[in-house]
Amino acid sequence: IVGGTNSSWGEWPWQVSLQVKLTAQRHLCGGSLIGHQWVLTAAHCFDGLPLQDVWRIYSGILNLSDITKDTPFSQIKEIIIHQNYKVSEGNHDIALIKLQAPLNYTEFQKPICLPSKGDTSTIYTNCWVTGWGFSKEKGEIQNILQKVNIPLVTNEECQKRYQDYKITQRMVCAGYKEGGKDACKGDSGGPLVCKHNGMWRLVGITSWGEGCARREQPGVYTKVAEYMDWILEKTQSSDGKAQMQSPA
């Protein structure tokens, strides 16, 4: 996160860290807890690393440097990448992770509410992006979970800023015209959440941007409301019943 500040314990209890353990262990992406056994993240996090057993999912943590060999983590039972996601495109950058064992909810580990299907009428004015990603373009992973308040921008405005890309209705953009605050490398898959009527909702999944926090280059997020049917279908068909936070 560029231009952010340290988060507090329990402030974003749905935020998880997706880490890979090969020779060493490292944080690669963020994700959002949406049910006892489900994490929502970005499909591109698994490009080149589709093997379930190399991944470790840490929930209920604030500081990555607190993780030791004894820190509990979740393992993956199943990775469900959107069927229309292609490595050659930026579309449908969404994936579900089914955990091997369900998580108990605590003050520091609980799910985020999902939006209503096709939610286009709600005007969100209080939106935040969180993650342990770089604090500048050529930076490094941060130890303490960062947060930053960023306004949504219209898709029309976003398309003007990204003429060389197709900004679809299944994407949502956020950023300041002058730049300075944004998600960055390592924040992928993490949440863009907005507070509306006293409730936090998962509006976007951190997907991509041209650099980080550049002027007139907003961050682009997968619009969760556009994938509610897919999320419900996959979580229900895998579980028999949906085990996740009901849409707001």
């Epitope: 060389d164 992928s188 991509w208």
Partner: antibody, heavy 125, light 108 residues
Framework: EVQLLESGGGLVQPGGSLRLSCAAS????????MTWVRQAPGKGLEWVSY????????IYADSVKGRFTISRDNSKNTLYLQMNSLRAEDTAVYYC??????????????????WGQGTLVTVSS | DIQMTQSPGTLSLSPGERATLSCRTS???????LAWYQQTPGQAPRLLIY???SRATGIPDRFSGTGYGTDFTLTISRLEPEDYGTYYC?????????FGQGTRVEIK
């Protein structure tokens, strides 16, 4: 299956004009940046021009700027290259290519993942 | 403009040998925008590597790419008969997009 098929090449005199076409199929053409690349006989590859998915943004190599115009018709899934004021040094095989732009570590990638078979343009008197 | 310099110009190797091709750029290139292509005579180029190190669909794992900044490498671990041809690196980090002049890999 992704396919790109160029046409319109041929022999033209110096100062003449030619319009190349590239018919695309097997993918959502309107979502992709498209590009032209050329290769003079026995030489390496040279990037010529690209056009944004909507067609509203175009960029050219200095060697063709002001003489060549790239365009597209998304309703016909076709890419074009209008070549005017042709010179002997424009003689080459012209390839159209799709520019794939995936996502890696919250940035986009950029690579020419599918190419046409090429069409030969010969500029000679 | 970003100049791309490939070396060596020609590489003469036997099947089964390892090929190491270098590509140096005159300015910093974001790795996400560095690709390698293979071209055999009479054929269109074929994408091998993108993002400096990711193999394109259907490319065998004997091909690998590495590098960062201004120094990039394509390695073919064990040459197969179908690997002979010309290899190009290309950047689309900044316009004008540019290719290297190519490295020809020929049978020794």
């Amino acid at each position: 299956e992704v396919q790109l098929l160029e046409s319109g090449g041929g022999l033209v005199q110096p100062g003449g004009s030619l319009r190349l076409s590239c018919a695309a199929s097997g993918f959502t053409f309107s979502h992709y940046l498209m590009t032209w690349v050329r290769q003079a006989p026995g030489k390496g590859l040279e990037w010529v021009s690209y056009i944004s998915p909507s067609g509203g943004h175009t960029i050219y190599a200095d060697s063709v700027k002001g003489r060549f115009t790239i365009s597209r018709d998304n309703s016909k899934n076709t890419l074009y290259l209008q070549m005017n004021s042709l010179r002997a040094e424009d003689t080459a095989v012209y390839y159209c290519a799709r520019v794939a732009r995936g996502i890696a570590a919250r940035s986009r990638t950029s690579q020419f993942d599918y190419w046409g078979q090429g069409t030969l343009v010969t500029v000679s008197s | 403009d970003i100049q791309m310099t490939q070396s060596p110009g020609t590489l003469s190797l036997s099947p089964g040998e390892r090929a190491t091709l270098s590509c140096r750029t005159s300015q910093f290139v974001n790795s996400n925008y560095l690709a390698w292509y293979q071209q055999t005579p009479g054929q269109a180029p074929r994408l091998l590597i993108y993002g400096a190190s990711s193999r394109a669909t259907g490319i065998p794992d004997r091909f690998s790419g590495t590098g960062y900044g201004t120094d990039f490498t394509l390695t073919i671990s064990r040459l197969e008969p179908e690997d002979y041809g010309t290899y190009y690196c290309q950047q689309s980090s900044r316009t004008p997009w540019t290719f290297g002049q190519g490295t020809r890999v020929e049978i020794k």
